[in-house]
Amino acid sequence: TPLGPKWPEPVFGRLASPGFPGEYANDQERRWTLTAPPGYRLRLYFTHFDLELSHLCEYDFVKLSSGAKVLATLCGQESTDTERAPGKDTFYSLGSSLDITFRSDYSNEKPFTGFEAFYAAEDIDECQVAPGEAPTCDHHCHNHLGGFYCSCRAGYVLHRNKRTCSALCSGQVFTQRSGELSSPEYPRPYPKLSSCTYSISLEEGFSVILDFVESFDVETHPETLCPYDFLKIQTDREEHGPFCGKTLPHRIETKSNTVTITFVTDESGDHTGWKIHYTSTAQPCPYPMAPPNGHVSPVQAKYILKDSFSIFCETGYELLQGHLPLKSFTAVCQKDGSWDRPMPACSIVDCGPPDDLPSGRVEYITGPGVTTYKAVIQYSCEETFYTMKVNDGKYVCEADGFWTSSKGEKSLPVCEPVCGLSARTTGGRIYGGQKAKPGDFPWQVLILGGTTAAGALLYDNWVLTAAHAVYEQKHDASALDIRMGTLKRLSPHYTQAWSEAVFIHEGYTHDAGFDNDIALIKLNNKVVINSNITPICLPRKEAESFMRTDDIGTASGWGLTQRGFLARNLMYVDIPIVDHQKCTAAYEKPPYPRGSVTANMLCAGLESGGKDSCRGDSGGALVFLDSETERWFVGGIVSWGSMNCGEAGQYGVYTKVINYIPWIENIISDF
């Protein structure tokens, strides 16, 4: 019996009945065995077929078989109800070998020409399976010449049998206080040959509760306990299971914070698996009772480990731990069933005793000493000499614990000295230098240090003076001896002040004329304002209307008198303003250099002379009465003049203060 070609030779060829295309003889038996490479099959088809037809092909036939299985027994020319002829059919081996047997019996009623067939090896597509047959691969099947291989979806690994996909279902750790876990693919059938481990790991103090939900279907056996697939639940205390079958297991209260769930499957079966909903519980903490004037949030039926609550106080109440304030309060329930912090109090906000107001006082409006939420106090300034700046002085204790004005300010009001008050009124008449009386010039400041000079009090801690008067002390402010509140130059009864800093106008050049002859002295302490010590006002924008030519100003000081000595008593003189051109002309003739009188200066005095300020008066104020406000303001600062004070045709020259308001305001606000 010819064997035909075997792999690795090329596997293709032709088969024919003996004597083909002539008729075949009786009593013939011929057998061919065809072998293809592994992973290949054989394909066979007939190009000619003419055999004696007999019932069930008992006489002459061609039999095709593959292994133990007969693929076909063929005879005749065309198929009948009980016999088969190949026609145009193609036949395939089941494996890599195909046996072809030809047989003829002892007689033929007429001549038959037999058969001719062609065969070839072809790749088997192992991935294609007949309906009802098990798939080649669990997940993905990949055919290739001579074979195939399987692969798995993400989350699975190929089993060592090379066909089954085992689930990668171990190492999952659940740390939330509740959750769900299920068999892989649930509710679809779970994978074969898998071993899954799930861990629930909660903080110490929690106890895990397991509930099987929806459906439970794990392969079982009628006699043996879960021999195929099973689910086991392990805690540090005990083991539950194994579980299998179709009945939902009962709730499991593990009394443990750690649970390990193991699920093992074998190579067969088609079951949907299981689903667990887990929750946890812990020892509850005492129910939090909100303190008076406070409330708890969130409100819960019970509070267990890790649960928390916060306390919020009503408006006007604050969180206090004893005397200590808290911005917020949150307590957390601990594993032993106690709260981690003690309950605070919601105490009414207490703004505390209000701060003292310099040069003012405070009155309790709500009640004596009442300083709690919504209490009202009233600040006021010492009458006559101080006035309240910015607000009305009414303050309320607000919920933030601060006394707050109606404008929302938390800082104290300011009692600002009233400026420009004098015991003296002017009749407008020019008369000779006179002795000042108490309260006439309460802004007058005596400056001693090297020479005698003067200045004028601004506010309660600044002195306005001439730059040339304090130039030598600009780097040693503490050397200035500043006295106020006295009429007598040599009197031991005066208010002493000391300088903190001296600010000389940056445009002033010493010994090169007197342009910008202005300076400010900052005192190291505020002075107390009274009838003898009162600041002078700075000129308003409208002040020029009170400083026109021939308007009367008043200069005061302890400077040289007609007798040539410094005055013992404060003296003053009322003098008119001189036309600026007239004054400029007066100082253009020698010995005065051209341009001595600038736009930053004003002149005052009599053409006939006799009324003037003199050496020792430098830095003092030339003041004017603002008839609208009835307050005195500084229009000029005693600066320079003729060598002979009060000389006819010459005038006293004063720094024009209104030109320096921005400079003064900047320095005072900056320092």
């Epitope: 004893g322 005397h323 304030p325 808290l326 911005k327 917020s328 505390g352 614990g401």
Partner: antibody, heavy 114, light 107 residues
């Protein structure tokens, strides 16, 4: 990790003012709590001087009220102690501490002497 | 001012023993009491606040109890590192006040 660190002069003359700084790291002084100054005299007696709260409100020991001021600079996360008119009785180690004293600084030693 | 009295200035104990430090307030302070430990050359360290709440990081051999006027700090299983001075403090009312201290010595 929250830390408090005191800084100051070490030596001050009688009648002068004492100024100390507490620098806080790892926690904002406006977030919560009271921020205290406490001193410990030779012999270990402790005295609470006062606090400034998260909101800037102050509370002082009445025995020091006329001389003490506690302020803060929120941009630098610092709070300050000023004690005026010091005497030799103010010689002590000065600590800053949070709230009831859950965190303390290392302390700074002050000697008042002419 | 509320006076916090620590009547025992010095207490002797042995390693492994249990010791109780007491503090008495001159008036009711609720539970607003803290306990501090101060080792030589160091700043005080809070052990207990609100009478019985242990500060974080404090070993559980330190426990506090009491309310109103009588307070106790108990150290069970005393260790050699517990050699220190212990202060109580009330933070109930202004001014906050401290006890004079109790020194613990290890025999």
């Amino acid at each position: 990790q929250m830390q408090l660190q005191e800084s100051g002069p070490g030596l001050v003359k009688p009648s002068q003012s004492l100024s100390l700084t507490c620098t806080v790291t790892g926690y904002s002084i406006t977030s919560d709590y009271a921020w205290n100054w406490i001193r410990q005299f030779p012999g270990n007696k402790l005295e609470w001087m006062g606090y400034i709260s998260y909101s800037g409100r102050t509370s002082y020991n009445p025995s020091l009220k006329s001389r003490i001021s506690i302020t803060r600079d929120t941009s630098k996360n610092q709070f300050f102690l000023q004690l005026n008119s010091v005497t030799t009785e103010d010689t002590a180690t000065y600590y800053c501490a949070r709230h009831y004293g859950d965190y303390w600084g290392q302390g700074t030693t002050l000697t008042v002497s002419s | 001012d509320i006076v916090m009295t620590q009547s025992q200035k010095l207490m002797s104990t042995s390693v492994g023993d249990r010791v109780s430090v007491t503090c008495k307030a001159s008036q009711n302070v609720g539970t607003n009491v803290a306990w501090y430990q101060q080792k030589p050359g160091q700043s005080p360290k809070a052990l207990i606040y609100s009478a019985s709440y242990r500060n974080s990081g404090v070993p559980d051999r330190f426990t506090g109890s009491g309310s109103g006027t009588d307070f106790t700090l108990t150290i069970s299983n005393v260790q050699s590192e517990d050699l220190a001075e212990y202060f109580c403090q009330q933070f109930n009312t202004n001014p906050l006040t401290f006890g004079s201290g109790t020194k613990l010595e290890i025999k």
